[in-house]
Amino acid sequence: KELKVTQPEKSVSVAAGDSTVLNCTLTSLLPVGPIKWYRGVGQSRLLIYSFTGEHFPRVTNVSDATKRNNMDFSIRISNVTPEDAGTYYCVKFQKGPSEPDTEIQSGGGTEVYVLAKPS
């Protein structure tokens, strides 16, 4: 099956202090390689979460990514702050014959708007 990375929501709004889910699904796990979430694009993009076992504060996977046929790479960001605002991209990599892995496809991006906490 041809690989496609889908981020269904173009944008989400979340109140500061709340949690939000950023959805991402794949149509294929091949070629093998990691899936990572970034905020922003280009050289200045920031790694938000990687499905490779590391711990990321405030960010967790939504589905059980240890399922060998898992195609859902959605994440939950907890206790959102204004600094979390921006556009988030779900990115599929192909393992490299040597470091680093090669980015092969990105989702369309989901913009996160952080609303002031109601007083």
């Epitope: 070629p31 093998v32 499905f51 490779t52 059980d64 240890t66 399922k67 060998r68 040597s98 470091e99």
Partner: antibody
């Protein structure tokens, strides 16, 4: 420190059943997929079965499908292998192993010996 | 099936390469496991093609290209004498496979 301790190995007769256990400690067990691997006397390593972190998905090598069942109890930090209709070919040391994100192995138990003999 | 040489030998200080072929680079990740005696617990020396656990000496390294993976031991030591198993995880079939093992003798 990550620790995996297998138990339940025994001498059994052909056709009998046995349940192996693996007690895990030193890591968040419920976050990791796990596998069982065996080694018959004088032979190499053979992967048998794997299970997802939540326990809903299981995977088996063809030769044990239908006879062996992998399961886990995350509240007890334990992994299990139920083995039915055992034959002499199942005689081996059985290891539990923690899986990496891409379903290879990073930590192994010391193993438990299963002997099937009449 | 994954294929690796039955045995290799080297003098202390030499560089040893053990190859493992038969996987598909598009769908396979490789790992390497050291077993010092039959029935003893294997030790992971490389996983994810080239990732070395923190407690494994830096003389062990791994790589994968095409349909093969390679374990390299740079400056081999007597204590590295063991059987080394390669393993692959196939993302097409969701199955793990081991090679038959390579006995490393340090002369």
């Amino acid at each position: 420190d990550v620790q995996l301790v297998e138990s339940g190995g025994a001498v059994v007769r052909p056709g009998e059943s046995l349940r192996l256990s693996c007690a895990a400690s030193g890591f968040t067990f419920s976050s990791y997929a796990m596998s069982w691997v065996r080694q018959a006397p004088g032979k190499g390593l053979e992967w048998l079965a794997g299970i997802s972190a939540g326990g809903s998905d299981t995977y088996y090598i063809d030769s044990v499908k239908g006879r062996f069942t992998i399961s886990r109890d995350n509240s007890e930090n334990s992994l299990y292998l139920q083995m039915n209709s055992l034959t002499a070919e199942d005689t081996a040391v059985y290891y539990c192993a923690r899986e990496t994100w891409n379903h290879l192995f990073d930590y192994w138990g010391l193993g438990t010996l299963v002997t099937v003999s009449s | 099936a994954l294929t690796q040489p039955a045995s290799v030998s080297a003098n202390p200080g030499e560089t040893v390469k053990i190859t493992c072929s038969g996987g598909d680079w598009y769908s396979t990740y490789y790992g390497w496991y050291q077993q010092k005696s039959p029935g003893s617990a294997p030790v992971t020396v490389i996983h994810s093609d080239d990732k070395r656990p923190s407690d494994i000496p830096s003389r062990f390294s791994g790589s994968a290209s095409g349909s093969a993976a390679t374990l390299t031991i740079t400056g081999v030591r007597v204590e590295d004498e063991a059987v080394y198993y390669c393993a692959g995880y196939d993302g097409r079939t969701y199955i793990n496979t081991f090679g038959a093992g390579t006995t490393l003798t340090v002369l």
